[in-house]
Every structure is written in C-alpha cells, then in structure tokens.
C-alpha cells in the first residue's frame, strides 16, 4: 500500500488509478494513506473519474476515509439516487490523516479509465463549528497556521483547559450604604468554571439588609444540595445558604457590618444568576427638635449612623452655643444612636451697646437699652459747635450683629467740629488795635517753643501756622508747648495741647525769603470745642471774591505792640487787603531784594502805617468773614513785614492760604 | 492643621498699651467660630479676656471691657489684643485660642509670657 | 458666673479612678468645657457640653453633670494624666474653675 508523503514533507501531489489514463484492470487494489502536520487537514478534489457503475460500488470503487469514519465511497461518472460519483465536490479530512482506497472486482463489462485526484493539505479553521455544535472557545477564538488560541473579554481570565473563561469576579468591596451586586453578565449566563467573592463592607453601627431581587437561576440537582454552582453569604455571625435553583432566596437581615458573599460554577450550564439588592440600617439618634427660631434640614423620618442634619435660624436670629458664635452647625449620628454634638440655640442677634460718639450722643429709639435685631438708635452730635459728617446718624441692628446706617455704613458717624464761629460781631470801620473779648478769636493757638508765635486750629487737632514760625522744632515737635482757650498769654487758665508732627512746606527754604511760608502742626489728642476753642474755616472756592483789595480782614496775636513788648491780652486789629503790585513795589526798594512778595503772598495794612501785625503775632490767621456762610475763613497767615511794624508806606505781608489748599488737604488726609 | 501663634513683647511698662498679635495658619478666622484671648497669672488661674467671632463681632470679659480692644486683619489672618493702662496685675501668659463649644477641636497658641514692669 | 472647683489637689494611683469636680454660681446648663494642662504646655481640650469627647481623647475620661454641678471622671488613671485640670462655663460670657491638680499619693 503505497503511503503518501508524511510532514514535514510538503504535503500535497497527484493520485491516479493504475494505468491512468488508460484503463485499469481487474482486481486491482490500491491504497494511499496521506498524512499532514497536527492543525492542518487534506484537501482532495478529482479532475478526472470514470469507475464502473454498480448498485451502491460494490463493484469498482474509490472509498475515503478519516480515522474510523467514511467520508465517502464513489463510483460512476455521474452521481445517482443510491451511487456518488464525486463531479466537483471536494473532500476534507477530518483530522491530519487522510486515507484513499481504490478497488477494482473481477470483471468489468466495457474499459473505464479511473481516476486523476489532486491533494494539498492546510489548515484547519478550528475557529469555524458546524451549527448546533459546541463553539471551540468561550469568547474570542483565534486561528492560525496550524493552530487555534483563545481568549478572554475583560474582567475574565482564560482557565487551564485554554478554553474556558472564567470570570474575574473576586476583590471587589462595596462599602456604600446601600447598592446593588449580581452574577456576572447578569441577566445573560453566567460565565463557567468561576470563583467569585463580594464583600460588603460598611462602618461598625450598620446592619446589612440583603434581598434577592428580579430572578434567581443557578444550577441545581433534584437529589443533592447544589452540587454544581452555588451561592453562599457569610458573616462573622453565622453562614447563609449554599443557594441554587430558580427561587429566590428570602431576604436575610446579616446583623452584621461585614458581609462576603462567594460564587461557584462549574464547567456546564447555562443559566442567568441571581442580583441582590443591598441595604442598611443602624441604631437611630433621637429626633431632632429645631431650637425656637431654627429649623432642621434635610428632614428626615429618621437619622441613623452617618447620618445627619443642620440648623438654620431665622432672619435675625444667630447660632450660639451658650456664649460662643457659630457660623454653621451639623451634628452627625453615631454608631451608638446618639448625636455627636448637643443642639444650639438660634438666639436673637444681639449688637450689643453702641459704641459712644466723640463729641455727641446716642438716643435709643426702640426702647430704653433695646439692643436686638432690628432695634434703632440715633446719634448726635453736641449741638452749636459740631455737625454730623456723611449720614443721618439714625443706625439699625442689622442680622450680621452689626449697628449699621441707612447707607450701609458699619462705622460710626463722624462729629465734625463747625469752623468759623465767633462772638465778634464786625462793622465795616477800621479802628486801633483793641482787645479781644471772650469767644472772638476761638481759634486762636499761642504756640511756645523758644519763641512766641500764634497759630489757629483746625478741625479739632491740627494748627495752622508760619513755617518760619515753627523751624526750629521741625525734628522736635514734642518741644512746643500748644495754648488755647485763653485771652492772657500768661493766664495759668487754659487747654494744652502738644504737637505729634510739625509739616512745614517743601517749597519753603528757611533764611531765604519768605515764600510758601506756611506749616501744619498734628495734634496728639483732638481738642473739645466749645465757644473759648472752635477751629477757623478753610477758604472755599469762591472765598477770592471776600478778599478783593480793600476788603477788611482781622489779624489777632499776642505779639509787640506799640510800646514794644508783647502784649498780655490777645489784640487784634481789622486791616484792608492792599493791592498786590502796590505791596510788590512797596518791598522792591532797598533794603529789601527784589521779588520779596511772590504771589503766594497777600498784603494788608493801611498806607499811613500804625495798624500792622508784629513780631509774636506770627502764624496768627487773618480771617475774613464770608458773608454767604456767615462763618470765619482764614485768608492769610502773619508771616512778614517791615522792621518797624505798623510803618508808613509798608504793609504786613501774609501767606495767602488759598494757594494752599491742596497741600492742607493732602497733608490732614494722609495724616 | 490649625495652628495659632502669639507674638508681641515680653516686656511693657506700667500705665502703657500692651498689643499681642495671633497669627492663624490652617484655617480662616472668618469661616466660623470664636477667636480669644486667654491668660494665665502665675499661680495658673485662668481668665477669659474677650473673642473676636468669624464675623467680626466682639465679646469682651465685663472686668476689662474699659480698656481692651480685639480687632483682626482678616487679609493676614490675624487678630490682635488690645490692652490699655496695664498695671503689674496684668503679668501673665497670654493665649490665643480658637473655641468652639465642641464644635471643630479647640486649639490654642503656646502662649507668650508678658511682664508689667518699669 | 463663677466656677468652683474646691479641691486644689488630688492625691491618686495608677489604675485609680477619680472625680473631679467643679460647680457653678447660677445655672449654665450644659454649657461646661474641661482642659487638662501639663506643666510648660497649653491646656488641651478633653470634654465639650458637659459630656462630649473630643476624638483622639480616651474614653476612661467621662464628663458628666448639668445646671450647676459637673464632674471629670478619670476611670483607671494612668502615670500621663498627672496634671491640672480646669473646668471652663461658656453659657454666659466665659469664665474657668480655679484647677484641680492631680498628683501621686
């Protein structure tokens, strides 16, 4: 029996009936046995065939067979009902091994030529089943030269038989309050040849509530307790189960915190699984009561461990825990069913006394000492010598604990002392230097401090005043000694004041003229005004059109008087504005250098002399009355003059403070 | 964490302003809660000054309500004691702390030591 | 309100249980913290609203009372609880007890 070639030979060629293509004899036997590499099949098909044709080959035949099996016995030259002649059908092995026998009997009634077959071996698509027949693998299967391989969708890993896939299906933990688990590919089969594990796994205080929800399928047996696949639930308390079958399992209350649950399944069976449906409880905390004025949020029919709520107090009313403020406060449950923290109060805001208002008064509106949510207060200030700055005064106890006015301002209102008031009453007449009376010159300031020199206040707690006057202590302000509230310039009787900062200004060069000769003195401590100290008036804008030459203006002081010493009771004289180039000229002869009045500087003074400031009187405050206002207004500052006060044909030269209002404002602003 | 650190002198004579500063570092003074001062007299009594709360408001012990002032920086969160006309009687360690009645953890500063002296 | 805290020391032994108490002037309900100080150190926050832990404390220290009369339970005392302990009011303003120290018999 000839044998065909074997592999790893290459694996294909040509088989004939002897004699082909003549005709081939009687009782002829042949038999060719081919063989192919493992993974791979025979391929045969015939170009040529012409056998004697009898009932079912008995005959003359050519039969196929693979291992045990007969693929096919053929005969002819054309198929019948009962005979097959194989035209141009192709024939495969069924393993690697193929085996081809030829007969021929005793006789044969006419010649036949017999057969011409072509093989060739390749490979087996093991990938390929026949319907109805099992699938090679159980997810993806791989073919190849050869050879198949299997594999596995994700969350599966391909089991020793290299065929199955078993579910990757252990590790996982639940640790939510409440979820759901199920079998893999739940409601599809579950997957073969599995071990799965869950644990639910919650805080200690929770009870584990498990229920089988929608439908339960796992392999059973009518005799034995699940044999095949099986469900188990295991506590540190006790083991539920093994579960198989098509009923639900009961709902089982775990007692426990920790729950794992395991799943078997065996090589066979297709069946859907099971999905629990997970829950917990715990012992509940007592139900909240909202203090009065609060309320609890999120409401609930109860609270358990974990769980937990807020309060909220009304419009007006705050969180305290006895004295101490709260912005917020959420109390948790506890594993033991009591709150972590104990209620709050929501106690109506209360802003508390209001803050006193220097140089003014607070009324309470609401009621006598009402200082709660929604109460009202009124300040004031202290009537003829201060004036409420900005707002109304009229504040509420707002719901952020605050007192607070119409406009939204959380600081108090400012008691700003009114400027410009005097006792004196002017006529139009110059006359001699006069005494001062009480209340004329309020703003009045003796500053002493090497020398004698005059100031006047402003606001309550700065002085204006000559830069040459104060030079000498601008490193050393603590060293002047700050008077007034007095008439006598050696009256024991008066109000202190000391300076904090002397601002002389940086266009004034000392020895060197008398330009921007003008300086400001910070009190350390306001001053309380009253009718003996009231600050004088900043010129407004439209101040020049009091001020125009001719227009009288009054200078005070404690300085030389005719009789060549200081005097001992504040003087003052009312004196007309000269005309600026007339006052230029009159200094521009010696022995005065030319461009001695700048026109930072106003003159004032009469042409035949004898009404003048002097020394001592220097920094003093000319004012002038605006009659719009009816207030004082400083104009000039006493700053320089002829050596010879009061002389004929020269005139007191002042610092003309409107020049200077922006320097003044800066400087009280940043200071 | 919560941290809370006084600062100021050692050393203030009598008659004059003693001013501590408490620098708060892991959380914001204006998010919740009371901000105090507390001291201790040698001998360990302790005494409440007064709290500046998260939103500014201020509670002061009544015995020292005339001379002290609690205020804040909330951009450098911090806050501050004022206490005015200090006489020996005020020698102590002074605290910052952060009390909440059980609500969040209370935390305290190391304290500083401040002596009234001249 | 004031604060009493009548013993000034505390004689104990390790493994001893021991109250220590602090009563009130006038009602402050609940409203009672207590610290506990070591020599050089800040006092440490053991007990809130009468009764409450803080976390991290451990629980053989137990506050208990309300109104007017508090108590700081130490169950089986140990060798690092040997400090002075002060109760605190803040019902109405703030005001601590005067410390109780405890000490090694």
């Known amino acids: 029996t000839p044998l065909g070639p074997k592999w790893p030979e290459p694996v294909f060629g040509r088989l004939a009936s002897p004699g082909f293509p003549g005709e081939y004899a009687n009782d002829q036997e042949r038999r060719w046995t081919l063989t192919a590499p493992p993974g791979y099949r025979l391929r045969l098909y015939f170009t040529h065939f012409d056998l004697e044709l009898s009932h079912l080959c008995e005959y003359d035949f050519v039969k196929l067979s693979s291992g045990a099996k007969v693929l096919a016995t053929l005969c002819g030259q054309e198929s019948t009902d009962t005979e097959r002649a194989p035209g141009k059908d192709t024939f495969y092995s069924l393993g690697s091994s193929l085996d081809i026998t030829f007969r021929s009997d005793y006789s044969n009634e006419k010649p036949f030529t017999g057969f011409e077959a072509f093989y060739a071996a390749e490979d087996i698509d093991e990938c390929q089943v026949a319907p109805g027949e099992a699938p090679t693998c159980d997810h993806h299967c791989h073919n190849h030269l050869g050879g198949f391989y299997c594999s596995c969708r994700a969350g599966y890993v391909l089991h020793r038989n290299k065929r199955t896939c078993s579910a990757l299906c252990s590790g996982q933990v639940f640790t939510q309050r409440s979820g759901e688990l199920s079998s893999p590919e739940y409601p599809r089969p579950y997957p073969k040849l599995s071990s799965c594990t869950y644990s639910i796994s919650l805080e200690e205080g929770f009870s584990v509530i498990l229920d089988f929800v929608e439908s339960f399928d796992v392999e059973t047996h009518p005799e034995t307790l699940c044999p095949y696949d099986f469900l188990k639930i295991q506590t540190d308390r006790e083991e539920h189960g093994p579960f198989c079958g098509k009923t639900l399992p009961h709902r089982i209350e775990t007692k426990s915190n920790t729950v794992t649950i395991t799943f078997v399944t065996d090589e066979s069976g297709d069946h859907t699984g099971w999905k629990i449906h997970y829950t917990s409880t715990a012992q509940p905390c007592p139900y909240p009561m909202a203090p009065p004025n609060g309320h609890v949020s999120p409401v609930q029919a109860k609270y358990i461990l974990k769980d937990s709520f807020s309060i909220f107090c009304e419009t007006g009313y705050e969180l305290l825990q006895g004295h101490l403020p709260l912005k917020s406060f959420t109390a948790v449950c506890q594993k033991d069913g009591s709150w972590d923290r104990p209620m709050p109060a929501c106690s109506i805001v209360d802003c508390g006394p209001p803050d006193d208002l220097p140089s003014g008064r607070v009324e309470y509106i609401t009621g006598p000492g009402v200082t709660t949510y929604k109460a009202v207060i009124q300040y004031s200030c202290e009537e003829t010598f201060y004036t409420m700055k900005v707002n109304d005064g009229k504040y509420v106890c707002e719901a952020d604990g605050f007192w607070t006015s119409s406009k939204g301002e959380k600081s108090l209102p400012v008691c700003e002392p009114v400027c410009g008031l005097s006792a004196r009453t002017t006529g139009g007449r110059i006359y001699g230097g006069q005494k001062a009376k009480p209340g004329d010159f309020p703003w009045q300031v003796l500053i002493l401090g090497g020398t004698t020199a005059a100031g006047a206040l402003l606001y309550d707690n700065w002085v204006l005043t000559a830069a040459h006057a104060v030079y000498e202590q601008k490193h050393d302000a603590s060293a002047l000694d700050i008077r007034m509230g007095t008439l006598k310039r050696l009256s024991p009787h008066y109000t202190q004041a000391w300076s904090e900062a002397v601002f002389i200004h940086e266009g004034y060069t000392h020895d060197a003229g008398f330009d921007n000769d003008i300086a400001l003195i910070k009190l350390n401590n306001k001053v309380v005004i009253n009718s003996n100290i009231t600050p004088i008036c900043l010129p407004r804008k439209e101040a020049e059109s009091f001020m125009r030459t001719d227009d009288i203006g009054t200078a005070s002081g404690w300085g030389l008087t005719q009789r060549g010493f200081l005097a001992r009771n504040l003087m003052y004289v009312d004196i007309p504005i000269v005309d600026h180039q007339k006052c230029t000229a009159a200094y521009e002869k010696p022995p005065y250098p030319r461009g001695s009045v700048t026109a930072n500087m106003l003159c004032a003074g009469l042409e035949s002399g004898g009404k003048d400031s002097c020394r001592g009187d220097s920094g003093g405050a000319l004012v002038f009355l605006d009659s719009e206002t009816e207030r004082w207004f400083v104009g000039g500052i006493v700053s320089w003059g002829s050596m010879n006060c009061g002389e004929a044909g020269q005139y007191g030269v002042y610092t003309k403070v409107i020049n200077y209002i922006p320097w003044i404002e800066n400087i009280i602003s940043d200071f | 964490d919560v941290q809370l650190q006084e600062s100021g002198p050692g050393l203030v004579k009598p008659s004059q302003s003693l001013s501590l500063t408490c620098t708060v570092t892991?959380?914001?003074?204006?998010?919740?809660?009371?901000w105090n001062w507390i001291r201790q007299f040698p001998g360990n009594k302790l005494e409440w000054m007064g709290y500046?709360?998260?939103?500014?408001?201020?509670s002061y012990n009544p015995s020292l309500k005339s001379r002290i002032s609690i205020t804040r920086d909330t951009s450098k969160n911090q806050f501050f004691l004022q206490l005015n006309s200090v006489t020996t009687e005020d020698t102590a360690t002074y605290y910052c702390?952060?009390?909440?009645?059980?609500?969040?953890?209370?935390?305290w500063g190391q304290g500083t030591s401040v002596t009234v002296s001249s | 309100i004031v604060m009493t805290q009548s013993q000034k020391f505390m004689s104990t032994s390790v493994g001893d249980r021991v109250s220590v108490t602090c009563k009130a002037s006038q009602n402050v309900d609940t409203n009672v913290a207590w610290y506990q100080q070591k020599p050089g150190q800040s006092p440490k926050a053991l007990i809130y609203?009468?009764?409450y832990r803080y976390s991290g404390v451990p629980d053989r220290f137990t506050g208990s009372g309300s109104g007017t009369d508090f108590t700081l339970t130490i169950s089986n005392v140990q060798s690092e609880d040997l400090a002075e302990y002060f109760c605190l009011q803040y019902n109405s303003y703030l005001t601590f007890g005067s410390g109780t120290k405890l000490e090694l018999k």
């Open positions: 892991g959380y914001s003074i204006t998010s919740d809660y009371a």
């Open positions: 702390a952060k009390l909440g009645g059980g609500h969040g953890m209370d935390y």
């Open positions: 609203s009468a009764s």
């Open positions: 500046i709360s998260y939103s500014g408001r201020t």
